[in-house]
Interface confidence: medium
């Protein structure tokens, strides 16, 4: 539930938010938190945030990691704080890639 006391508050979680979609905020609230990593123009792009409606994250969170994108989802307040999504390496590195946090 949302806070400790009430029985009728939406079950939303506070999530760490990092990336362009966050604007000036460092947090967001939703039914699921996520941490993602994708390769965009040779850069590793890390993002964190939330899915406000459970259905939004249902497909995304169930998608297995691919060489180009990985998303990890969780439910719980600030649960994505210490999660860093990882791409499957299969013993290979991606030449010319750099780590890059979208701000």
């Amino acid at each position: 539930m949302e806070d400790e006391k009430p029985k009728v508050n939406p079950k939303l979680y506070m999530c760490v938010c990092e990336g362009l979609s966050c604007g000036n905020e460092d947090h967001c609230e939703g039914q699921q938190c996520f941490s993602s990593l994708s390769i965009n123009d040779g850069f590793h792009v890390y993002q964190k945030g939330c899915f406000q409606v459970y259905e939004q994250g249902k497909m995304t969170c169930k998608t297995p990691p691919s060489p180009g994108q990985a998303v990890e989802c969780c439910q719980g307040d600030w649960c994505n704080r210490n999660i860093t999504a990882q791409l499957p390496t299969k013993g290979k590195s991606f030449p010319g890639t750099q780590n890059f946090h979208l701000e």
């Epitope: 949302e2 006391k5 009430p6 029985k7 307040d77």
Partner: antibody, heavy 115, light 106 residues
């Protein structure tokens, strides 16, 4: 006895502003999210928005009908929450309730928007 | 936004009747649904939360059921004090209320 008491309602002209208060007694408001719900005469209940507690960064959310016009805030040291209304329209005329969820509801305060 | 559709809007019944009010959500809300009773000039009173959990002090003649998108409030034997307006409320994503069902004396 646990209760919430709203105050600050009254008559305001269209386009005007008003700040309604919600004071708690008998329990600590700071533990809970505070929601505001309104009810026009003879109509149903409409959720306006809410403010979460300190551990949740006092996050606010609003119904589309009031977003950008209404602001919810709280002062935990005074055990009070507030609803600041601006750009008021005649259709905002209603009884405004605050609630901490469960059976913690105020008695409501009437806001009338009319010229 | 999640929409809540309640039916009927008015229900005429007699003391002792068993009545059922239904509520439908525009998308799945699991069991994050509450039922309220409201009397004229008074604030709403919580009867049921989490679709079927009875709030403390509420008579056992009130019961709720359902999950996903379809929910019901049942009063097993209507009492004089039960003539009022009833609202369903989803709290899966913020709050939305149904339009209300007025239970009146037949």
């Amino acid at each position: 006895e646990m209760q919430l008491v709203e105050s600050g309602g009254g008559l305001v002209q269209p386009g005007g502003s008003l700040k309604v208060s919600c004071a708690a007694s008998g329990f600590t408001l700071s533990d809970s999210s505070i929601h505001w719900v309104r009810q026009a005469s003879g109509k149903g209940l409409e959720w306006i928005g809410r403010i979460r507690s300190k551990p949740y960064s006092y996050a606010t959310a609003y119904a589309a009908s009031v977003k950008g016009r209404f602001t919810i805030s709280r002062d935990d040291s005074k055990n009070t929450a507030f609803l600041q209304m601006s750009g008021l329209k005649t259709e905002d005329t209603a009884v405004y309730y605050c609630t901490g969820g469960d059976d913690f509801w105020g008695q409501g305060t009437l806001v009338t928007v009319s010229s | 936004d999640i929409q809540m559709t309640q039916s009927p809007s008015t229900l005429s019944a007699s003391v002792g009747d068993r009545i059922t009010i239904t509520c439908r959500a525009s998308q799945s809300i699991s069991t994050w649904l509450a039922w309220y009773q409201q009397k004229p000039g008074k604030a709403p009173k919580l009867l049921i939360y989490k679709a079927s959990s009875l709030e403390g002090g509420v008579p056992s003649r009130f019961s709720g059921s359902g999950s996903g998108t379809d929910f019901t409030l049942t009063i097993s034997s209507l009492q004089p004090d039960d003539f009022a307006t009833y609202y369903c409320q989803q709290y899966n994503t913020y709050w939305t209320f149904g339009q209300g069902t007025k239970v009146e004396i037949k």
